[in-house]
Amino acid sequence: NKILVKQSPMLVAYDNAVNLSCKYSYNLFSREFRASLHKGLDSAVEVCVVYGNYSQQLQVYSKTGFNCDGKLGNESVTFYLQNLYVNQTDIYFCKIEVMYPPPYLDNEKSNGTIIHVKGKHLCPSPLFPGPSKP
């Protein structure tokens, strides 16, 4: 039995930040679980992890180069990514594992979310201001 995951197909980070919501066909209340966010088509780079259990506060881990926070819903984990760079534009996959109570469960691979990080286009100040009017 596998948990199904729903993600938005695409998100645009205009201000170098984005909320990626991973919605599960499973209620995480009173469960020990590990939710993670993976970068790249092959999911090779795990960038954020949210660990939760029934007795502790939610724990969030960010890989170096990523600024990540996590929020738990009954059937979702939302990853809040900040300070994203244009070169971090990629496809991101949500993964979930539930360890307790048994049985161990994980998810069917989701379709992923393309996060498109838009660079900040600041209007450059003119190098040579025009002649000043009298």
């Epitope: 993670s36 795990e46 992890v49 724990q59 881990y61 994980d106």
Partner: nanobody
Framework: EVQLVESGGGEVQPGGSLRLSCAAS????????MGWFRQAPGKEREFVAA????????DYAESVKDRFTISRDNAKNTVYLQMSSLRAEDTAIYYC?????????????????WGQGTLVTVKP
């Protein structure tokens, strides 16, 4: 809950070698990392080396690169620290740590569980 038990510490002469082991037990997920930190008397606990479950990510403190090697046996849930060319400044209590992060984290705060520590003494 995760339990960690270290072994392998002892006294060795400068230039000598030791291998530390750390066995983990408890509920494990498909990816996590384990690391070694050390604490010399009167000093902060500092990062030494770490490796993730998939063994595709390892990291070392600058001071131990080319002298220490971290490895793991996933079948035994055990991480090893092979220490060679030991110096007096490597004398410390070595602690094994466990983190739910899936990468070789050097951040002490990322580690949720710690072993009891094993003493390594390097002296002539």
């Amino acid at each position: 809950e995760v339990q960690l038990v270290e072994s392998g510490g002892g006294e060795v002469q400068p230039g000598g070698s030791l291998r530390l082991s750390c066995a983990a037990s408890g509920r494990m997920f498909s990816n996590y990392a384990m690391g070694w930190f050390r604490q010399a008397p009167g000093k902060e606990r500092e990062f030494v080396a770490a490796i993730n479950y998939r063994r595709d990510d390892a990291d070392y403190a600058e001071s131990v690169k080319d002298r220490f090697t971290i490895s793991r046996d996933n079948a035994k849930n055990t991480v090893y620290l092979q220490m060679s060319s030991l110096r007096a400044e490597d004398t410390a209590i070595y602690y094994c740590g466990f983190t739910y992060a899936g990468w070789a984290s050097s951040r002490r705060d990322d580690y949720n569980y710690w072993g009891q520590g094993t003493l390594v003494t390097v002296k002539p």
